[in-house]
Every structure is written in structure tokens, then in C-alpha cells.
Interface confidence: low
């Protein structure tokens, strides 16, 4: 039988009446155009909805937008368009919501062609009031908030000027011209690239990387011959043109660009690219594109300095620069990532790592599933997950994989069971242990979301026909109840719940269509009465993450430590609540060779945990350029994996001697560094 339909599924008592009392409809007085929705702050219940409608005239497009505000998680909305003087808001800039709980919102308005600059509407009270401000420039990008101070904003203008505001957009100052890309770093630092000659495109590979730590009073050139740059975790990366040819190399800095080291990664040619797939304060996953239009490359994982890299995964699917990759961080369990590889026969297969890229394997076949037509052996196959690439290929996949840090172990995704991803209609699968085991959760494609830190999962069938039914589960997707939320079906466009999965409210968005008009409509359902009591100690059970062999004392050890969690029992129907904090208990493991990556000049042969010297470097002194000094490395081939906390056990010795000799890459020599003041 289909999941959730067997006899042992207990029904939630009187749920229809409870949900009916907590279902709130709001019909928007709008012609259907586009709608965008933003949450303002955390746990505030404030939602802003911007609807825009374009009327195409023969020569130009006339636009109209409306702004609505809710302060009860979407149950009721108020039209606040008059607060922004009924101005048409540019949807391509979206609504710029301030970091944390600052309550700040910036809307960018459409202005007539001849105006001197753009116009913004600013609010610092969770959109209760707005102030109109005319800008001395036309913005090219959305306003970017400093992560450290929400009063500091930066924006690029259509004329490539870098503009900064120190008073939340009230007053603006152009701090630099000829800027291609600008990003906030830590401590209110701004990094940006500039061109000297023609334009950003013409100077690609000859750009300079600059830094200002005082919002434009003074500047320091920290890189030349730059192609592009990126920030990830505590690392600053720059791809830099080589002297002799058109290849580029990655350089990395961990001190905001004061000193640089060349990353031990392959160089790339004109048609290739680098991409930071994921980064934290410990390490980085880097994709390096293969030469030619292959659609794949190699994933490398870094050491703690971002300099020494280990090959993690070959034939990693990643189509062209800025294209699609299925690389997904499973946020519900430490160390877990999922992605796709392009196999020799051009089929796409899903791979998973449980140890931050150390080893990749196929996903285990779900117990309750048959192998499909892609499988050579009907008894042996794997689960393959649909993610960004499938969505870009217009397969019948409405959503990417979903996981939430506070819903420990839960991963939900569309997939197919076979030897490779299938183009057939997918089903929805769930894992409750961070990707080790999977179960078919729902037949056919669905939209899904997690509420109350995993206490409730909500799903809506993906259909071209109007819908009026929502499904929900209180036991991590084992059993499902269906609820008819309206008599009149709507054309469904999306599910919205507050980011962070702590809420118990879900909003169903769609439109109604009659003979003459169509209107936006939302239904907000509050599940608080389904989970009628607060969870108590007895509702939780101890769960050891990454457990594969309970008989082994080191069971669950990943990156040198194991973690036990208190998790809600599947049979408990109760509220984790908005203040729920994941309870976990770490314990340190003994070190083994698995806790070390191979150092510079060493590699791991396949299926071997020992690091051996690279043949071409055998007998040579290992000397390399680090922070602008030549270093001599004495090593037996191992370096602890970033973030690994193991103690005792094996302990390979490693020593780096400073040769006190200056060395530079072609990238940036200390003499070239210069500082300027405005």
C-alpha cells in the first residue's frame, strides 16, 4: 500500500474541526501579475507581500504594484500601498530585508526616464512606516546591508559607482568609481574590484581588488590581475591571471587580503570556472571545471588554511559558469552533503558524503521501493535525488531537497530508484537519519515544508489542475492526513512558512480564475490545535547520529567526535514550540588515519587510508609559497581534517619550517601593495 495508508496509522483526533477553526483566507484586491513575499524579522509574524502587474502598451509597459502587510503570520493582510505613495516598486530588486531582527526594509521604486537618480522607501520599524528618499544615482543592484551594522548600506550604480550610506540610506556617498563587484566582509569591511581601462568586461583578468575598512575613507589595493573574487567562511578567494598565458589560479587569504597563498588547485583556462560550493570557518568545498564543454568538474576539499586541497569527487555535475549544480548541504546533520555526478554513459547519479567530502557513496535503496527501468539489476540500485539541475531541465520536480538544522536528521527530496536519475515522474522520499536510509513518503511530485522543528510536515500535490487539499504528517512522514482547506479549488503557486521551520503556520498561495478576472488568494493554516500540548521529557528519545554499527565503540564518530541528540518520538503528537533548542551531547573519539587528510605533496590511493608521496615529488624537498615566504615542510603526509576534534590514537607528526626566503606568486608582491586615502 502507499505510504501512510496502512492500518497502523493512527488518525489525529478531530483534526478537521481544529484546522477549520484555524484556517484564514485572504483575497487580494489585485489582478494577477507576480507576487513576492518576505518575512521581516524572526518570530515577529510580519510578512510583506508585493504584487505587481504589468500592462503592456504598444510602446512601453505601464506597471502597478501593491504592498500588503501582515503581523499575524499571514492570517490577515492590510493594504499599505499608500505608505509608499502608491509608487511602482521594481521587483527585480525585491524587498531588501535587514539582517537579524533589525526591522529594516528597503524597497526600490521605478522612476521615470529623465530623473537624476532612483528612489527608495525605507522602514526601520518592521514596515509600519516608510520614508521616501531620492537617490543621487540609479541603482544597478539591490541595497546590501552590512552583516555587522544594518545602518550601513552599499549599492552599485548603473554607472559603476560604489555608493555607501552610513545612516540606513538617508544620505549616500560615492566612495569609488569604475567598480565591477562589491561585497561586505567582516567588521564592516568592503571588498571590491575596479577596472582601469574600458569596462568590467574588457578588463576581466586585469581588475584590481581593493579593500576599505573605514567605509571609504582609505583604501588598500590587495590584488592585481584579478578575474573575480569571492568570500566563504573566513576565507577570501581571488582567481588571478597567470603571467604567461590566459590561465587563472585561485589565491586565498585568511587575513582580509593582507597576505595571500596560492591554493594547490589546478589552474583553469578561459572557458573554465571555479566555484565555491560551500564554505565555513573550517574549510571550503571548491569545484574546478574540466576543460571543454563537459558539464562536469572535480570537487576539492581544503585544509584549514584553504591552501592544500584533496580531491573529493570526480565528474561532479556543474553546467557552465553560473549554471546548475545539485550540490546540497544537508543542514539537518553535520558533515552531510548530496550532489550529482555525470557518469561515463552521460547518465546522472546522486552521491552522498557523511564526512564532509572524505568519501562519497550512492544513496541506499529505500526499503519500500522497486528498482525502475534504469536499473540493470532489478534487486540492486540506489536512490537518486532531483535537485537544481532537474528543475532547470523542466522535469516534473517542483522543489529542491529540504532539510532544516532544527529538524535533526530529516531530509525530504524528490527522487527515483534505479541506476541513475530518471526522467519519469518522481516520488517524494524522506530520510530521518541524515541520508543514511530512505523511505518513500509520498507518491508523485509534491511541494513540502517542515513546521515546528520537524513536529509537522506539510505537503501539497503538484498538479496542473486547481487544488483544495493539503496533506500533513505528525510522525516524520510515516502517516498522512488530508484536509480540504477550501470548497473552491485554487491554482496553486506556492507554500510559504516562516524561515527556520519553527512556525506552526503555513500559507498556501494561489489564484482564482473566473471568466473575466483572476485574483491572488492566500490560505493560512495554524496547526497549533493539532499539536495541542507542549512536548515533555517523555516525548523525546536519545538518538546517536551517524550510527552504522552499534557494536562498535567508535560508532557515530565523524570528524573526530560523535553526537547524541534528543529527538521527538514519532509517536508523540505535541509542540516542540518556537523556543525549541536542539539538545545534543558531543563526545570525542580517538584519532585514526581517517581523521587526517593528505598533506601537500601526498595523495591517497583508492581504497587506502594511508597517504603516500606523489611520485613526481619523491625525494624532493617540499617547499612552497605561503603568506609570501618560502616554507620548508617536514611531514609524514598527514594534516588533520578541518573541524576534526579527535584526540589520542594515531598522531602523525608534522612540522613547517620558515625558510626566511621571500617568495611571491605572480599575483601580488609586497612592493605592489599600496594604500590610499580619500
Amino acid at each position: 500500500s502507499a505510504p501512510g495508508e496502512d492500518e497502523e496509522c493512527g488518525r489525529v483526533r478531530d483534526f478537521v474541526a481544529k484546522l477549520a477553526n484555524n484556517t484564514h483566507q485572504h483575497v487580494f484586491d489585485d489582478l494577477r501579475g507576480s507576487v513576492s513575499l518576505s518575512w521581516v524579522g524572526d518570530s515577529t509574524g510580519v510578512i510583506l507581500v508585493l504584487t505587481t502587474f504589468h500592462v503592456p502598451l504598444v510602446i512601453m509597459t505601464f506597471g502597478q504594484s501593491k504592498l500588503y502587510r501582515s503581523e499575524d503570520y499571514g492570517k490577515n493582510f492590510k493594504d499599505i500601498t499608500d505608505l509608499i505613495n502608491n509608487t511602482f516598486i521594481r521587483t527585480e530588486f525585491g524587498m531588501a530585508i535587514g539582517p537579524e531582527n533589525s526591522g529594516k526594509v528597503v524597497l526600490t521604486a521605478e522612476v521615470s526616464g529623465g530623473s537624476r537618480g532612483g528612489r527608495i522607501f525605507r522602514s526601520s520599524d518592521f514596515a509600519k512606516n516608510f520614508v521616501q528618499t531620492d537617490l543621487p544615482f540609479h541603482p544597478l543592484t539591490q541595497m546590501m546591508y552590512s552583516p555587522q551594522n544594518s545602518d550601513y548600506l552599499l549599492a552599485l550604480s548603473t554607472e559603476n559607482g560604489l555608493w555607501v550610506s552610513k545612516n540606513f540610506g538617508g544620505k549616500w556617498e560615492e566612495i569609488h568609481k569604475a567598480v565591477c563587484l562589491a561585497k561586505w566582509g567582516s567588521d564592516n569591511t568592503i571588498f571590491f574590484t575596479t577596472y582601469a581601462n574600458g569596462s568590467c568586461k574588457a578588463d576581466l583578468g586585469a581588475l584590481e581588488l581593493w579593500r576599505t575598512s573605514d567605509l571609504g575613507k582609505s583604501f588598500k589595493t590587495i590584488g592585481v590581475k584579478i578575474y573575480s573574487f569571492g568570500l566563504g567562511g573566513r576565507f577570501l578567494f581571488a582567481s588571478v591571471m597567470a603571467d604567461k598565458d590566459t590561465t587563472r589560479r585561485i589565491h586565498v587569504s585568511t587575513d582580509q587580503g593582507d597576505t595571500w597563498s596560492m591554493a594547490q588547485l589546478p589552474s583553469v583556462g578561459q572557458e573554465q570556472f571555479y566555484s565555491i560550493l560551500a564554505a565555513n570557518d573550517d574549510m571550503v568545498f571548491m569545484h574546478v571545471d574540466e576543460p571543454g564543454d563537459t558539464g562536469f568538474g572535480t570537487i576539492f576539499t581544503s585544509d584549514d588554511r584553504g591552501i592544500v586541497y584533496s580531491k573529493s569527487l570526480d565528474r561532479h555535475l556543474y553546467t557552465t559558469t553560473g549554471g546548475e549544480t545539485d550540490f546540497t548541504n544537508v543542514t539537518s546533520l553535520r558533515g552531510v552533503y548530496i550532489t550529482s555526478v555525470l557518469s561515463e554513459d552521460n547518465s546522472i547519479q546522486t552521491m552522498i558524503t557523511f564526512d564532509q567530502g572524505g568519501r562519497w557513496t550512492h544513496l541506499r535503496k529505500p526499503e519500500n521501493s522497486e528498482c525502475d527501468a534504469t536499473a540493470k539489476n532489478k534487486n540492486e540500485c540506489s536512490l537518486h535525488i532531483h535537485a537544481s539541475y532537474s528543475i532547470s531541465q523542466k522535469l516534473n520536480v517542483p522543489m529542491a531537497p529540504l532539510s532544516e538544522p532544527n529538524a535533526v536528521g530529516i531530509v525530504i527530496a524528490h527522487g527515483s530508484v534505479g541506476d541513475a536519475i530518471s526522467v519519469m515522474v518522481p516520488d517524494v522520499y524522506i530520510s530521518d537519519d541524515g541520508g543514511y536510509s530512505w523511505t518513500k513518503m509520498l507518491e508523485g511530485p509534491h511541494y513540502y515544508t517542515i513546521l515546528d522543528s520537524g513536529g509537522i510536515i506539510v505537503a501539497i500535490e503538484h498538479s496542473s489542475r486547481p487544488i483544495n487539499v493539503i496533506k500533513f504528517s505528525t510522525d516524520e512522514g510515516q502517516c498522512w492526513q488530508t484536509y480540504t482547506f477550501t470548497r473552491d479549488p485554487i491554482y496553486f503557486t506556492g507554500l510559504a512558512s516562516e524561515p527556520g521551520a519553527r512556525s506552526m503556520n503555513i500559507s498556501i498561495w494561489g489564484f482564482t480564475e473566473s471568466f473575466l478576472t483572476s485574483q491572488w488568494v492566500s490560505y493560512t493554516i495554524d496547526f497549533k490545535d493539532i499539536l495541542e500540548r507542549n512536548c515533555e521529557e517523555k516525548d523525546y528519545t536519545i538518538w546517536l547520529a551517524h550510527s552504522t554499527d552499534p557494536e562498535d565503540y567508535e560508532d557515530g564518530c565523524i570528524l573526530g567526535y560523535k553526537e547524541q541528540f534528543l529527538r521527538l518520538r514519532k509517536s508523540s503528537v505535541c509542540q516542540n514550540g518556537r523556543d525549541y533548542v536542539v539538545t545534543k551531547q558531543p563526545s570525542i573519539c580517538l584519532c585514526s588515519l581517517e581523521d587526517f587528510l593528505c598533506d601537500f605533496g601526498y595523495y591517497r590511493p583508492e581504497n587506502d587510508s594511508k597517504c603516500v608521496e606523489q611520485p613526481e615529488l619523491k625525494g624532493h624537498d617540499l617547499e612552497f609559497c605561503l603568506y609570501g615566504r618560502e616554507e620548508h615542510l617536514t611531514t609524514n603526509g598527514y594534516r588533520k581534517i578541518p573541524g576534526d576534534k579527535c584526540q589520542g590514537g594515531v598522531n602523525p607528526v608534522r612540522e613547517v619550517k620558515d625558510l626566511k626566503k621571500k617568495c611571491t606568486s605572480n599575483f601580488l608582491s609586497p612592493e605592489k601593495q599600496n594604500s590610499k586615502s580619500n
Epitope: 557494536e551 565503540y553 567508535e554 551531547q585 580517538l590 585514526s592 584526540q647 589520542g648 590514537g649 594515531v650
Partner: antibody, heavy 124, light 107 residues
């Protein structure tokens, strides 16, 4: 019942090696750490290191690194501790002890079952 | 290495007395502390694990408390068979280290 039985007393000359055995019974030998602790006459307890029989993974105290080797033979549920280049201050009672397994939350490496001890005397 | 300091190093008490032994770690060890009892010529015996959990088979007059750096072993009513040496042991960070011991003697 769970017990650890150690080999008999040894008298060794300085510079020699000694190998003490510890036979386990009454539980799944492979799944529990086996720790080694020694006690010099009139002194306190000193941790030397341990081995996890399931994978043979070892952990040694820095003080004994290079001189101690811990091994196991899972087929006969026996752990061994060999100490080389013996000195007179290695004279002690050597104990093997089973690492306590946590029931739920990790509870630290306690030692819940001990061998009777093996007296090693190093004297010229 | 983490140093474990026990105090007192010895004490005299009578049957029925309440006895308290303290153990201090040179850095925080969370609650990863165990207490052992050792009688002359015998192997140590685990009394308390994880700072406050009583090992099965150990009389309830033994109790442990503390976390971080300061820990206590309490014998609520000393019995004749309790005269022995008591050791604390941390297992938070490798290497495992023991306290110097507290000898409980008959007054």
C-alpha cells in the same frame, strides 16, 4: 559473568621487554575498549593507553609512545600490552581494564571491570 | 595534560561519619569524571561515572557531584568496608589522567 584474567608475575632485567596478556570472558570482547593502567609500589594510578579490539585502533600516553605496543587477538578474546626497553622505574602492577560503554549520552571512558593485575619487577 | 588534584591526600574518620573528598581539574572537563575505590593488593573498583551516576552494584551511600573543574565524592555514612584509597579520573581529553588518591583511614 564478566571477567578479565591477566598473565602471571614477571621478573625482567633492564633493557628487556615484557608482554602481559589479558583474557576477557562474559561479554563481546571486540566492542569494548581495553585500557592499560599501571601502579608503581606505593604510588597512584597511571594510564598507559588502550586498544579498541574491533578495529585494532590504539591510543597511547605520550610518555610510553615508542616503548609500548598494544595488540589483541579477537579469536581468543585476549588483549596484550608489551613494554620494551624496561627500566627499574617500570617496576609496577599492570592492570587491564574494560572501558565502560555509555548507555545513552556519552559518559566518558570509565573502567568498569578490572583484571587482577600483573606484577612486573625490573631488576638487574 | 589535564592535572587532577585530590584533597585531602588522607583523612581519618569513624564508622557512620559523612566523608567528602574533592577533586579539581586544571581545566574544564564537563562531567567526564569517574571515582574509583582501591583496597590494598586489589584492583580499583568503579564507584561513580560521569560525575554523578552510580555504577550498578555500588551502595547508595556513595554519591558524586560537580561539573567543569570541581567535583566531590561523598560517603554519607562510612562503613567498615569503605576504608580504602579513592581516586578520581578524567576522561574528557586524552591522555586520561588520575588524581593522586585520598586514603581514608580508621580514626
Amino acid at each position: 559473568q564478566v571477567q578479565l584474567v591477566q598473565s602471571g608475575a614477571e621478573v625482567k632485567k633492564p633493557g628487556a621487554s615484557v608482554k602481559v596478556s589479558c583474557k576477557a570472558s562474559g561479554y563481546t570482547f571486540a566492542s569494548y575498549y581495553m585500557w592499560w593502567v599501571r601502579q608503581a609500589p606505593g604510588q597512584g594510578l597511571e594510564w598507559m593507553g588502550g586498544i579498541l579490539p574491533s578495529g585494532g585502533r590504539t591510543s597511547y600516553a605520550q610518555k610510553f609512545q615508542g616503548r609500548v605496543t598494544m595488540t589483541r587477538d579477537t579469536s581468543i578474546s585476549t588483549a596484550y600490552m608489551e613494554l620494551s626497553r624496561l627500566r627499574s622505574d617500570d617496576t609496577a602492577v599492570y592492570y587491564c581494564a574494560r572501558g565502560k560503554r555509555s548507555s545513552g549520552w556519552y559518559e566518558g571512558y570509565g573502567m568498569d571491570v578490572w583484571g587482577q593485575g600483573t606484577t612486573v619487577t625490573v631488576s638487574s | 595534560d589535564i592535572q587532577m588534584t585530590q584533597s585531602p591526600s588522607s583523612l581519618s574518620a569513624s564508622v557512620g561519619d559523612r566523608v567528602t573528598i574533592t577533586c579539581r581539574a586544571s581545566q574544564s572537563i564537563s562531567s567526564y569524571l569517574n571515582w574509583y575505590q582501591q583496597k590494598p593488593g586489589k584492583a580499583p573498583k568503579l564507584l561513580i561515572y560521569a560525575a554523578s551516576s552510580l555504577q550498578s552494584g555500588v551502595p547508595s551511600r556513595f554519591s558524586g557531584s560537580g561539573s567543569g573543574t570541581d567535583f566531590t565524592l561523598t560517603i554519607s555514612s562510612l562503613q567498615p568496608e569503605d576504608f580504602a584509597t579513592y581516586y578520581c579520573q578524567q576522561s574528557d581529553v586524552s591522555p586520561i589522567t588520575f588524581g593522586g588518591g585520598t586514603k581514608v583511614e580508621i580514626k
